[in-house]
């Protein structure tokens, strides 16, 4: 019987973690890092963290910004350190969005 193919170990990245999901840690490890901004009841909520499984982040990261939410994703250690997600505003067109541009 042939040996099983070795499982490919996905690369894990260290990411800045900010927000309720981080508990009392300021970093996390995952296959992608993200920085997000969402508007809840008129309040801006900034979060940073990890997408643990690549598939988990794939859809979210491909979603174009909307007036209520924006997510920026990256792969690399601490790549979300200096990234702040921005909401689009009406004006210049943004790829995949309806006539919005970044602030």
């Amino acid at each position: 019987m042939e040996d099983e193919e070795p499982k490919v170990n996905p690369k894990l990245y260290m990411c800045v973690c900010e927000g309720l999901s981080c508990g009392n840690e300021d970093h996390c490890e995952g296959q992608q890092c993200f920085s997000s901004l969402s508007v809840n009841d008129g309040f801006r909520v900034y979060q940073k963290g990890c997408f643990q499984v690549y598939e988990q982040g794939k859809m979210t990261c491909k979603t174009p910004p909307s007036p209520g939410q924006a997510v920026e994703c990256c792969q690399g250690d601490w790549c979300n350190r200096n990234v702040t997600a921005r909401l689009p505003t009406k004006g210049k067109s943004f790829p995949g969005s309806q006539n919005f541009h970044l602030e």
Partner: antibody, heavy 119, light 112 residues
């Protein structure tokens, strides 16, 4: 190459405090979390806590919360651990260790600081 | 806290022989990100511990292929084939899935 150079052995009196240092070289200091580990004579290893040199964020083992204080000096790429109210139970070797990326655990260790608490 | 139970405490082996060390955790070491943060270290006499295996089965750079790690969930094993004199020392498992991080109590590998 990566090196963590710790301060020298110390003989201290009960009730005193001690501050030990861990100078990092061979990598970008603010990109790797620094942990501290205690090894009592002839015993296993105990995790004390960590500090994120970039943010200064810390996390402590509950057991050492009132005993240890972790700080860093980014300008000199040095991590520090202060141990207070020393007792004979604190006599041990203390290691600073670097937590590697890509889930590698503690990839580099300092040479250790032997602390002896005795009157 | 997660308790790491390591066995045996002492392991006498013949040079060129095989050795197996077990580490059991009191709860699953599978992290919310799907990874299992179980690592193995060797502490040679008078030295600092050194990383052998990370995340259950990955050899750290420079570690010979005589060392291998396996396991899942709560049950892990470090195997050493063709034991050489430089392999002697204390072996420790460490879990870094849960805070506080916890080590096994150690296994002393010695010549029979």
């Amino acid at each position: 190459q990566v090196k963590l150079l710790q301060s020298g052995a110390a003989l201290v009196k009960p009730g005193d405090s001690i501050r030990m240092s861990c100078k990092a070289s061979g990598y970008t200091f603010t990109d790797y979390i620094i942990h501290w580990v205690k090894q009592s004579h002839g015993k296993s290893l105990e995790w004390i806590g960590y500090i994120n040199p970039y943010s200064g964020g810390t996390n402590y083992n509950e057991k050492f919360k009132s005993k240890a204080t972790l700080t860093v000096d980014k300008s000199s790429s040095t991590a520090y651990m202060e141990f207070c109210r020393l007792t004979s139970e604190d006599s041990a070797i203390y290691y600073c260790v670097r937590r590697g990326h890509d889930g590698t655990g503690f990839d580099y260790w300092g040479q250790g600081v032997m602390v002896t608490v005795s009157s | 806290d997660v308790v790491m139970t390591q066995t045996p405490v002492s392991l006498p082996v013949s040079l060129g022989g095989q050795a197996s060390i077990s580490c059991r955790s009191s709860q699953s070491l599978v992290h919310s990100n799907g990874e299992t943060y179980l690592h193995w270290y060797l502490q040679k006499p008078g030295q600092s511990p050194q990383l052998l295996i990370y995340r259950v089965s990955n050899r750290f750079s420079g570690v010979p292929d005589r060392f291998s790690g396996s396991g899942s969930g709560t049950d892990f094993t470090l195997k050493l084939s063709r034991v050489e004199p430089e392999d002697l020392g204390d072996y420790y498992c460490l879990q870094s899935t849960h805070l506080p991080l916890t080590f096994g109590s150690g296994t002393k590998l010695e010549i029979k």
